[in-house]
Interface confidence: low
């Protein structure tokens, strides 16, 4: 872009013309227009070619025309013209950058008389020593209190020289301040060192609450000590109310654990609940216009003094973006055990999870996993598949979090990872899993169950098998038989009982000789194909006194199918009135293929098999 040709701009001044004095350099970040000028109205700087062709005096230029100027151009102006420019900028309410203000201040070599006519923020860059008399300094610092001190960073030399000069001007001796002193200092009160906070807590703490920038370390420690001491204006933390918490807003991040623990829990809760719904707690929108990427970067920068040095309760007062910006992921990882004891909201936990995800993109190390606590509930099965969990303690810690709930996909994935890592379901693991999820064993496929070593069966309780189907019991029963093989009869039966749904006929026949008195509930869970070949005598011995229960179950499998296989005469010997057996004179043909399909034996009744009957009768008569 071509710069306009230099021309006389300021009349009879005789200084070199300022061809580009008011040229828009907004794109270079020179100017930050106020919201009213450029933010909401969408106003932009006007091209200056027309202005330069017919130069008016500075005060007649519009705000758009006054929007930007480089310092080099000002250095060629006389002090009088600089003052004129400064006054025009004040009148038009043009917001200047720090560089422009500093530049103008340097050119105003002697202390201006008409302070009120200058831009307020310009005063911050003037040397306070130039206003040494009592009246001059009072006038100067009265105006300063209305300026935006935070234009200057805390370390800036201009800002550092203001506070001592202001204290001297207001006649403050020592560290004891009155309410009037604090008021007179305005924004500079935020710079008062810790000794002032310690000695003047009653009047200074309420002012520090509204300081825009974070307090420095010295101030934080003094504020913390004053608040913990319980003196005025807030009193002991144990007596704080929700309105106290509201009043302390700006100081909440400096509260240490001892203070937070002293506040009644109900008060913290009520305050948090209210503040989470209070729109005034939202992050204020940035009002200064900047290129978009700058704003995003700023939002993620941690405000100074808020960097977390440890994971503690003070973090519950951090907004989500502050947690993101101020909590170091490595610190979080090393102090994960503390997270569980802090009542973070689920939204805050999301932020913490995000930090860990960034730190460990390939999956968390076990040292972190073991201490995840409630953060585990935020993990997806995809997250968990990246883990390598080998310690039973880690498994227990995470199962504890989900205790009392159905097995979630996360838990199922965790267990799967753990068992695969171990290669088999050993006794300790099974013990742990069934303690948390009694139905766990029955959620495994027969293939998965085949990896259970017989020694692990000792950990299984009857209720752990309640939901197992016959295919699963088919796998578990041989393992149980092996595990309990050295026990004596009655003890063996107690242990094997819940696995009998997988027992074959020959084992049931053997048990019937042991005088075991199987209950009906167990009998009803036996495999139908294993029960069918049992004789009435064998079933009677197997059930003992419980045999009477067969009557109540005669319509249900496997009792129904077993009855159909028995001779009615044999059933009648039980004296239970069981009906449906094979009548006398009927022949049972064991047509295995048909029985496999229908589940019932093939009975050849009168009609089709008269020949067979005739032969039968003949042999009977004979």
């Amino acid at each position: 872009m071509a710069l306009p040709t230099a021309r006389p701009l300021l009349g009879s001044c005789g200084t070199p013309a300022l061809g580009s004095l008011l040229f828009l350099l907004f794109s270079l970040g020179w100017v930050q227009p106020s919201r009213t000028l450029a933010g909401e109205t969408g106003q932009e700087a006007a091209p200056l070619d027309g202005v330069l062709a017919n130069p008016p005096n500075i005060s007649s230029l519009s705000p758009r025309q006054l929007l930007g100027f480089p310092c080099a151009e000002v250095s060629g102006l006389s002090t009088e013209r600089v003052r004129e420019l400064a006054v025009a900028l004040a009148q038009k309410n043009v917001k200047l950058s720090t560089e422009q203000l500093r530049c103008l201040a340097h050119r105003l070599s002697e202390p201006p008389e008409d302070l009120d006519a200058l831009p307020l923020d310009l005063l911050l860059f003037l040397n306070p020593d130039a206003f040494s008399g009592p009246q001059a300094c009072t006038r100067f610092f009265s105006r300063i209190t209305k300026a935006n001190v935070d234009l200057l960073p805390r370390g800036a030399p201009e800002r550092q020289r203001l506070l001592p000069a202001a204290l001297a001007c207001w006649g403050v001796r020592g560290s004891l301040l009155s309410e009037a002193d604090v008021r007179a200092l305005g924004g500079l009160a935020c710079d008062l060192p810790g000794r002032f906070v310690a000695e003047s807590a009653e009047v200074l703490l309420p002012r520090l609450v509204s300081c825009p920038g974070p307090l420095d370390q010295d101030q934080q420690e003094a504020a913390r000590a004053a608040l913990q001491g319980g003196g005025p204006p807030y009193g002991p933390p144990s007596t704080w109310s929700v309105s106290t918490m509201d009043a302390l807003r700006g100081l909440l991040p400096v509260l240490g654990q001892p203070i937070i623990r002293s506040i009644p829990q109900g008060i913290v809760a009520a305050w948090r609940q209210r503040s989470s719904r209070d729109p005034s707690w939202r992050q204020p929108e940035r009002t200064i216009l900047r290129p978009r990427f700058r704003r995003e970067v700023e939002k993620t920068a941690c405000p100074s003094g808020k960097k977390a040095r440890e994971i503690d309760e003070s973090l519950i007062f951090y907004k989500k973006w502050e947690l993101e910006a101020c909590v170091d992921a490595a610190l979080l990882a090393t102090q994960m055990d503390r997270v569980n004891a802090i009542p973070f909201t689920y939204e805050q936990l999301d932020v913490l999870k995000h930090k860990l995800d960034e730190l460990y993109p390939q999956g968390y190390p076990e040292s972190v996993i073991q201490h995840l606590g409630y953060l585990f509930l935020k993990m997806s099965p995809e997250d968990i598949r990246k883990w390598n969990v080998t310690s039973l303690e880690t498994l227990k810690a995470l199962l504890e979090v989900n205790k009392g709930h159905e097995m979630s996909p996360q838990v199922a994935t965790l267990i799967d990872r753990f068992v695969k890592g171990r290669g088999q379901l050993d006794k300790d693991t099974l013990d742990t899993l069934t303690a948390f999820y009694p139905g766990y064993l029955c959620s495994l496929s027969p293939e998965e169950l085949s990896s259970v070593p017989p020694s692990s069966i000792w950990a299984v309780r009857p209720q752990d098998l309640d939901t197992c189907d016959p295919r699963q019991l088919d796998v578990l029963y041989p393992k149980a038989r092996l595990a309990f093989q050295n026990m004596n009869g009655s003890e063996y039966f107690v242990k094997i009982q819940s696995f009998l749904g997988g027992a074959p006929t020959e084992d049931l026949k053997a048990l019937s000789q042991q005088n075991v008195s199987m209950d009906l509930a167990t009998f009803m869970k036996l495999r139908t194909d294993a029960v069918l070949p049992l004789t009435v005598a064998e079933v009677q011995k197997l059930l003992g006194p419980h045999v009477e229960g067969l009557k109540a179950e005669e319509r249900h499998r496997p009792v129904r199918d077993w009855i159909l296989r028995q001779r009615q005469d044999d059933l009648d010997t039980l004296g239970l009135g069981l009906q449906g057996g094979i009548p006398n004179g009927y022949l049972v043909l064991d047509l295995s293929m048909q029985e496999a399909l229908s589940g019932t034996p093939c009975l050849l009744g009168p009609g089709p098999v008269l020949t067979v009957l005739a032969l039968l009768l003949a042999s009977t008569l004979a």
């Epitope: 829990q265 109900g266 008060i267 913290v268 809760a269 009520a270 305050w271 948090r272 609940q273 989470s276 004891a341 009542p343 909201t345 689920y346 409630y374 509930l377 979090v401 205790k403 009392g404 709930h405």
Partner: nanobody, 130 residues
């Protein structure tokens, strides 16, 4: 303004039963997606103890070991009331019983008993004599 009012306390012989109720005004149990309703008790000279809690979102309930199997917590959204049914009462159940609500907490905090209960009732006295 949230107000919780307990009722149903009184004196009873050991082995007897009582049903405590907690009615809320200025707040509707069902209007918050995440809250934890709890009954707490405090015997003279002892610390306040969480007796039972319910997380309506999931229907999960949590009990102190000392009352498991004897006490049951439940809620009636229509009546905006939470109940504590106390059976097989023992002399050691004697205490002031408080109803409390934690708004906006997760199920995890309800479960762990570490939930921040922001609203409390005035309490109702339960006395069990042997």
């Amino acid at each position: 303004q949230v107000r919780l009012v307990e009722s149903g306390g009184g004196s009873v012989q050991a082995g007897g039963s009582l049903r405590l109720s907690c009615a809320a005004s200025g707040y509707t149990y069902s209007s918050y997606s995440s809250n934890c309703l709890g009954w707490f008790r405090q015997a003279p000279g002892k610390e306040r103890e969480a007796v039972a809690r319910i997380y309506p979102n999931s229907g999960s309930t949590y009990y102190a070991d000392s009352v498991k199997g004897r006490f049951t917590i439940s809620q009636d959204n229509a009546k905006n009331t939470v109940y504590l049914q106390m059976n097989s009462l023992k002399p050691e159940d004697t205490a002031m019983y408080y109803c409390a609500v934690a708004v906006g907490v997760g199920d995890n905090w309800c479960a762990s008993g570490a939930a921040y209960f922001g609203y409390w009732g005035q309490g109702t006295q339960v006395t069990v004599s042997s």
